[in-house]
């Protein structure tokens, strides 16, 4: 079909905010569980601690986590798992003050990546029981299909 | 030609990761040499320490550098050089801890800019022999044609 | 009308840089006044301390502020006001060193949001007389209509 001004295909988008964050027993990572705050298009699906890619393609991904933790460095790793392998897409790293009153930093990163159908995207904090602020305007994850 | 659903022109994108970083003798800057990790479209080409713009237009540019340096503040400057002049587009600045074990920070910034055909884009760290982590998920540079 | 290759609708964009920043008497916030550095499309209008949305839709918003302040944590809040209510869209937070020579940090964040016609977008620093660097490549605000 020909694209009219009205029909012109829009970018699929998904903006996610936290439900909670957990560390499994004996795990040295903290994972965030996500819920949609904004969704346009059908190609992305929040599934608990991951996001499933239904439409393969090139995406702008962005991630922010708000840390309230005195551990010397904090940060998040955004990874995709699919086709039998795991790949780190990007990381954000922030040195933290040792004083609890000062230890308050958001860490934002983003990039453009090719995602495959069936990939599961996740945000991992490589610390057990990381102290996060799960406010929806401080910690979030997003996708734009380009 | 009329655009059909299939023909609809996609955004040109380029996501670059480091090959190496060098400071020329007697230089007070560190430059990063780039290689493509993802490219769609023909309008952008990695050229060692710079990226050449072949298609003029409005681009989303993003840059992250991962610093492991105790210098009091670190950061990167993203500039374009063309038509006989140089222009700083955006900067990222991060204060660093003085203790080497804690001095680990990524610095991300991005923005939308009009780039001209023949412009050379570069990422400069205004420090001699800056200590960078050149992991491809910690230090990267990207473009999306809007 | 049918979209041809030439007519194909481009993304509206707006990239803003500071004019100044002020704290009203007895106010515990600092606001930035903006001017356009790049504009494409008619759907967004800088209006002093805010940006008016003329075309409703889904936007990528980004904000960076460059802080030169020893206050223990600094950061900015990006909000929209419209339809009789105010909503925080996203925040950036940065812990600051206590030594003035080291207290130099940019804070960048971004996300995708649905904005309504008539919304006013603003960047607030929740500190009285915050010490900002208003260089256009250190402090800026931007929008891309998706």
């Amino acid at each position: 079909a020909v694209l009219t001004q009205k029909q012109k295909k829009q970018h699929s988008v998904l903006h996610l905010v936290p439900i909670n964050a957990t560390s499994k027993d004996d795990s040295d990572v903290t994972e965030v569980m996500w819920q949609p705050a904004l969704r346009r298009g059908r190609g992305l699906q929040a599934q608990g601690y991951g996001v499933r890619i239904q439409d393969a393609g090139v995406y702008l991904l962005y991630s922010q986590v708000l840390f309230q933790d005195v551990t010397f460095t904090m940060g998040q790793v955004v990874s995709r798992e699919g086709q039998g392998r795991q790949e780190t897409l990007f990381r954000c790293i922030r040195s933290m003050p040792s004083h609890p009153d000062r230890a308050y930093n958001s860490c934002y990163s983003a990039g453009v990546f090719h995602l495959h159908q069936g990939d599961i995207l996740s945000v991992i904090i490589p610390r057990a029981r990381a102290k996060l602020n799960l406010s929806p305007h401080g910690t979030f994850l997003g996708f734009v299909k380009l | 030609a009329v655009l059909t659903q299939k023909q609809k022109k996609q955004h040109s994108v380029l996501h670059l990761v480091p090959i190496n970083a060098t400071s020329k003798d007697d230089s007070d800057v560190t430059e990063v040499m780039w290689q493509p990790a993802l490219r769609r479209g023909r309008g952008l080409q990695a050229q060692g320490y710079g990226v050449r713009i072949q298609d003029a237009g409005v681009y989303l540019l993003y840059s992250q550098v991962l610093f492991q340096d105790v210098t009091f503040t670190m950061g990167q400057v993203v500039s374009r050089e063309g038509q006989g002049r140089q222009e700083t587009l955006f900067r990222c600045i991060r204060s660093m801890p003085s203790h080497p074990d804690r001095a680990y920070n990524s610095c991300y910034s991005a923005g939308v800019f009009h780039l001209h055909q023949g412009d050379i884009l570069s990422v400069i760290i205004p420090r001699a022999r800056a200590k960078l982590n050149l992991s491809p998920h910690g230090t990267f540079l990207g473009f999306v044609k809007l | 009308a049918v979209l041809t290759q030439k007519q194909k609708k481009q993304h509206s964009v707006l990239h803003l840089v500071p004019i100044n920043a002020t704290s009203k008497d007895d106010s515990d916030v600092t606001e930035v006044m903006w001017q356009p550095a790049l504009r494409r499309g008619r759907g967004l209008q800088a209006q002093g301390y805010g940006v008016r949305i003329q075309d409703a839709g889904v936007y990528l918003l980004y904000s960076q502020v460059l802080f030169q302040d020893v206050t223990f944590t600094m950061g900015q809040v990006v909000s929209r006001e419209g339809q009789g209510r105010q909503e925080t869209l996203f925040r950036c937070i940065r812990s600051m060193p206590s030594h003035p020579d080291r207290a130099y940090n940019s804070c960048y964040s971004a996300g995708v949001f649905h904005l309504h016609q008539g919304d006013i977008l603003s960047v607030i620093i929740p500190r009285a007389r915050a010490k900002l660097n208003l260089s256009p490549h250190g402090t800026f605000l931007g929008f891309v209509k998706l």
């Epitope: - | 990761v17 090959i19 290689q35 990790a37 993802l38 080409q45 050229q47 050449r52 | -």
Partner: antibody
Framework: EVQLQQSGAELVRPGSSVKMSCKTS????????INWVKQRPGQGLEWIGY????????EYNERFKGKATLTSDTSSSTAYMQLSSLTSEDSAIYFC?????????WGQGTLVTVSA | DIQMTQSPASLSASVGDSVTITCRAS??????LAWYQQKQGKSPQLLVY???TLAEGVPSRFSGSGSGTQFSLKINSLQPEDFGNYYC?????????FGGGTKLEIK
């Protein structure tokens, strides 16, 4: 020290396929791209393509699309190039080379001879 | 694709001589040109990139120049180890293409 060690010479039949390897050492394999270059006996050099090992993204010279397939195995730090539907025109030395867009380190080459 | 034309195809010179090899691009490639040396039975070795920047470890008797469509590689005071084949390569955009080569022989 960066090293690129290529597999040995191949004698193959027309119409068949061949897969050659480029085993790397001395650097982080997944952080860099590998280029492949063809050199016919007594002739010049031809760029085939490039693969970024970190995610498998590849760029090909249009002339080699459908002919060459670039892959890698991160567990053994080895890059591979498969050539299909071989003809006498594919008889050549094939080099792997590191860095982009100029080539700083080269393998020693793999000689492929296509003959009935 | 951009065509690269090298000249001469071959030349003879003596140890101590200076020689110049030229390379012409079919379109403007600015300064995006590399030069390689290849000895018989060996892999190519990078000499120059960005038209004039010497690669690490390359002796200073080698120098590159030119921009746009015309480029040259000059070797001052030829040494015995300098004899072999020389290739130019544009790195303006993919596909990267090479010149046909220049064979430098001992007179």
């Amino acid at each position: 020290e960066v090293q690129l060690q290529q597999s040995g010479a191949e004698l193959v039949r027309p119409g068949s396929s061949v897969k050659m390897s480029c085993k790397t050492s001395g650097y982080t394999f997944t952080s860099y791209g590998i280029n492949w270059v063809k050199q016919r006996p007594g002739q010049g050099l031809e760029w085939i393509g490039y693969i970024y090992i970190g995610n498998g993204y590849a760029e090909y010279n249009e002339r080699f699309k459908g002919k060459a397939t670039l892959t890698s195995d991160t567990s053994s730090s080895t890059a591979y190039m498969q050539l299909s539907s071989l003809t006498s025109e594919d008889s050549a030395i094939y080099f792997c080379a590191l860095y982009y867009p100029w080539f700083t380190y080269w393998g020693q080459g793999t000689l492929v001879t296509v003959s009935a | 694709d951009i065509q690269m034309t090298q000249s001469p195809a071959s030349l003879s010179a003596s140890v101590g001589d200076s020689v110049t090899i030229t390379c012409r691009a079919s379109e403007n490639i600015y300064s995006y040109l590399a030069w390689y040396q290849q000895k018989q039975g060996k892999s190519p070795q990078l000499l120059v990139y960005n038209a004039k920047t010497l690669a690490e470890g390359v002796p200073s008797r080698f120098s590159g120049s030119g921009s746009g469509t015309q480029f040259s590689l000059k070797i001052n005071s030829l040494q015995p180890e300098d004899f072999g084949n020389y290739y130019c390569q544009h790195h303006y955009d993919t596909p990267f293409t090479f010149g046909g080569g220049t064979k430098l022989e001992i007179k």
